[in-house]
Amino acid sequence: MRTEAQVPALQPPEPGLEGAMGHRTLVLPWVLLTLCVTAGTPEVWVQVRMEATELSSFTIRCGFLGSGSISLVTVSWGGPNGAGGTTLAVLHPERGIRQWAPARQARWETQSSISLILEGSGASSPCANTTFCCKFASFPEGSWEACGSLPPSSDPGLSAPPTPAPILRADLAGILGVSGVLLFGCVYLLHLLRRHKHRPAPRLQPSRTSPQAPRARAWAPSQASQAALHVPYATINTSCRPATLDTAHPHGGPSWWASLPTHAAHRPQGPAAWASTPIPARGSFVSVENGLYAQAGERPPHTGPGLTLFPDPRGPRAMEGPLGVR
């Protein structure tokens, strides 16, 4: 279960110590401090497991470590969604779940994690070195994507550890505005703290709610992870591409492996490292998709109708109005 960040309750300053302005400047740093502390980088983890019973059957599990509300999850294979990857499933917290062959069953495991069972025979079955990617669109973090695959040496029935793999790809820099505001706030906070360090700090009441959910941690890549497999997005393994299926993929025809996006904004910025260690990598910044690329005047490739990303997937009247209506 995710827990939302709690703003510490502030004790009012003793009467006569500060005027109205002083009170405001005292409260503001702590509000900003809370924002800075809770604005941790989200992280996506991916776990791929080959079933021992069926060698052509895979289970992909993905999760989002962040405090935001997930508004859409897209699972793809052959690379990141929108960078040559083929969508296997789309899960919306309220509007439903859709999967495409060879995906058999997609489901939510928790409010912030999903699982997908893949099965196939012959050309449509995934192979051991297939890359699977999960993209989480959340509010307010934006879209975050990570990829994973079975380690080459893994035996059937064993699973790759959860791999929060960094993906250095920015579809839109919309989230930078939010980051900029937070950065400015943090700098301003430090400035205020320095100015007011002679004043006593306000007493904090301990929060009565459960502690913060695990947050993404900054992580210096170890040699092991740096030595992990590096695959450029364009290098898609065509030896196990799916056959042309009557339950077709939401984008592209048989030549899906060549369907690289046409806009530079969607092109890979560098190779993705599929970490083979369970150490959480720094969350991968991808983009914010609020308003479905409305600011950029384009839509992400292969995703379809415009969805407003709502702050709370359980929120009231979550999907009002026609999608993408002009």
Partner: antibody, heavy 119, light 107 residues
Framework: EVQLQQSGPELVKPGASVKISCKAS????????MSWVKQSHGKSLEWIGD????????SYNQKFKGKATLTVDKSSSTAYMELRSLTSEDSAVYYC????????????WGQGTSVTVSS | DIQMTQTTSSLSASLGDRVTISCRAS??????LNWYLRKPDGTVKLLIY???RLHSGVPSRFSGSGSGTDYSLTISNLEQEDIATYFC?????????FGGGTKLEIK
């Protein structure tokens, strides 16, 4: 306002084929999959399949494979469903419905096209 | 395929009544249960999705509830325009499947 305008009623002979249309307006055609649903007299609704207007990719209910073919014409924002080798079992009202992401809910429906198969 | 069952095929009620229509899935559908109505003139509309979320423009007298395999649609204050056949549909897996429908009539 979202509108799905379907073609008029059809009276066809057994063994023949029929192609019904669904013209979309009031939204971006490529933003929604187009689903087709069968309503037989006195029976429930049955999902036939859907088509992705971006590229024409289709998904079918196993029951209707070989019976229905779904296509789109992006230039005219129109979806089509062809039914072949018609029998009396195919006599029904057929609906088109626009399905938004993740292409599950049928958000907006056409008025229906009645197909009667009779010799 | 997931089977959807609406045990009541027809229902009579008076205007102003509170009416409840039920629907059962053959397996857990994780609240991905949607309700549609088909009016006597043949028009079909989405009413409720995700068990309880009202689609845009749907009057607040409609409400939905349920979880797991059992779901229900309630009309709190029946109006003449609510006379229709109501269908449930699961949005959990393909193929999309519907219940048999419940025809609501005025007493």
């Amino acid at each position: 306002e979202v509108q799905l305008q379907q073609s008029g009623p059809e009276l066809v002979k057994p063994g023949a084929s029929v192609k019904i249309s669904c013209k979309a307006s009031g939204y971006t055609f490529t933003d929604y999959y187009m689903s087709w649903v069968k309503q037989s007299h006195g029976k429930s609704l049955e999902w036939i399949g859907d088509v992705n207007p971006n590229n024409g990719d289709t998904s079918y209910n196993q029951k209707f494979k070989g019976k229905a073919t779904l296509t789109v014409d992006k230039s005219s924002s129109t979806a089509y469903m062809e039914l072949r080798s018609l029998t009396s079992e195919d006599s029904a009202v057929y609906y088109c419905a626009a399905s938004g992401l993740p292409y599950v809910l049928m958000d907006y429906w056409g008025q229906g096209t009645s197909v009667t198969v009779s010799s | 395929d997931i089977q959807m069952t609406q045990t009541t095929s027809s229902l009579s009620a008076s205007l102003g009544d509170r009416v409840t229509i039920s629907c059962r899935a053959s397996q857990d559908i994780s609240n991905y249960l949607n309700w549609y109505l088909r009016k006597p003139d043949g028009t079909v509309k989405l009413l409720i999705y995700y068990s309880s979320r009202l689609h845009s423009g749907v009057p607040s007298r409609f409400s939905g509830s349920g979880s797991g395999t059992d779901y229900s649609l309630t009309i709190s204050n029946l109006e003449q325009e609510d006379i229709a056949t109501y269908f449930c549909q699961q949005g959990n897996t393909l193929p999309r499947t519907f219940g048999g429908g419940t025809k609501l009539e005025i007493k």
